[in-house]
């Protein structure tokens, strides 16, 4: 098995992940593993020397960087919050704060904005990933209602009057719950079924 550094006349290295091509010497050298950087470059006679990233810096991949990249905090002004701290092998992991969605994306989310309200009679369609996009409001399905303007309120099932030993006084709509009454209560005149002859 050939170990770096080794000559390569065709500009390609055997291990594309862990080696890189050094064109001036026409050799393949080792990259440094995640969490480290190049402290001494390779030569024809000596392979790359790597050192560990200092505190508050990182390199995520096999690399031949001569520095580690600085850890950056999640910017609360941009609506971001931290979900995992920076380590020598991974940058700070951020997400949108609750009630917000990602409005600007450049490899990762850079700016979050408030989710839009869903009007009464609708709810936000559930997404695979929280904070990925703005609300898409969909109507409450049959037998459900939602009576506020809110980014997060869910449609609730209409009350079943019979489950409480009551009878329906007014049917539920997409924006309001069923109204129930005691069976003994008399109906208001306009709802009475009595006909005068």
């Amino acid at each position: 098995q050939v170990v770096p550094p080794y000559g390569s006349e065709n500009q390609t290295c055997r291990d594309q992940e862990k080696e890189y091509y050094e064109p001036r010497h026409r050799i393949c050298c080792s990259r440094c593993p995640p969490g480290t950087y190049v402290s001494a470059k390779c030569s024809r006679s000596r392979d790359t020397v790597c050192a560990t990233c200092a505190e508050n810096s990182y390199n995520e991949h096999w690399n031949y960087l001569t520095i580690c990249q600085l850890c950056r905090p999640c910017d609360p002004v941009m609506g971001l919050e931290e979900i995992a701290p920076c380590t020598s092998k991974r940058k700070t992991q951020c997400r949108c704060q609750p009630g917000m969605f990602c409005a600007a994306w450049a490899l990762e989310c850079t700016h979050c904005e408030l989710l839009s309200d869903c009007p009464p009679g609708t709810e936000a369609e559930l997404k695979d990933e929280v904070g990925k996009g703005n609300n898409h409001c969909v109507p409450c399905k049959a037998g459900h209602f939602q009576n506020t303007s809110s980014p997060s309120a869910r449609c609730q099932p209409h009350t079943r009057c019979e489950d409480q030993g009551l009878v329906e006084a007014a049917p539920g709509t997409a924006q309001s719950d069923t109204t129930c009454r005691n069976p003994s209560e008399s109906l208001p005149p306009e709802m009475s079924g009595t006909m005068l002859m």
Epitope: Y20, N59, W62, Y64
Partner: nanobody, 117 residues
Framework: DVQLVESGGGLVQPGGSLRLSCAAS????????MYWYRQAPGKQRELVAI???????NYADSVKGRFTISRDNAKNTVYLQMNSLRPEDTAVYYC???????????WGQGTLVTVSS
């Protein structure tokens, strides 16, 4: 993945100039070293110029003082300005980029430069 497209090659008289471009597209992000190589008919591919991620440039002895490598990071493009061209500069010119901060090694398809009167 990353695609590289070279342009700017063609037929030019000795003493003339050409500017080659190499534009990267696709999932192109990160920190890169960029290179120009050339391959003359029946010869091995040879390194012409280097532009490192740190801003350093380097040239083959045969083109020093005549060729200039530059890059526009905002446009994901590397250039090769070739002046005082000679017949021996005739070759297919290839752009090559190597990602520094992560694995990644890519070639363009090449552009033909012919220097002839």
């Amino acid at each position: 993945d990353v695609q590289l497209v070279e342009s700017g090659g063609g037929l030019v008289q000795p003493g003339g100039s050409l500017r080659l471009s190499c534009a990267a597209s696709g999932r192109f992000f990160g920190i890169y070293d960029m290179y120009w190589y050339r391959q003359a008919p029946g010869k091995q591919r040879e390194l012409v110029a280097i532009s490192t991620s740190g801003g350093h440039t380097n040239y083959a002895d045969s083109v020093k003082g005549r060729f200039t490598i530059s890059r526009d990071n905002a446009k994901n493009t590397v250039y090769l300005q070739m002046n005082s061209l000679r017949p021996e500069d005739t070759a297919v010119y290839y752009c090559n980029i190597q990602r520094v901060d992560a694995p990644g090694f890519y070639w363009g398809q090449g552009t033909l430069v012919t220097v002839s009167s």
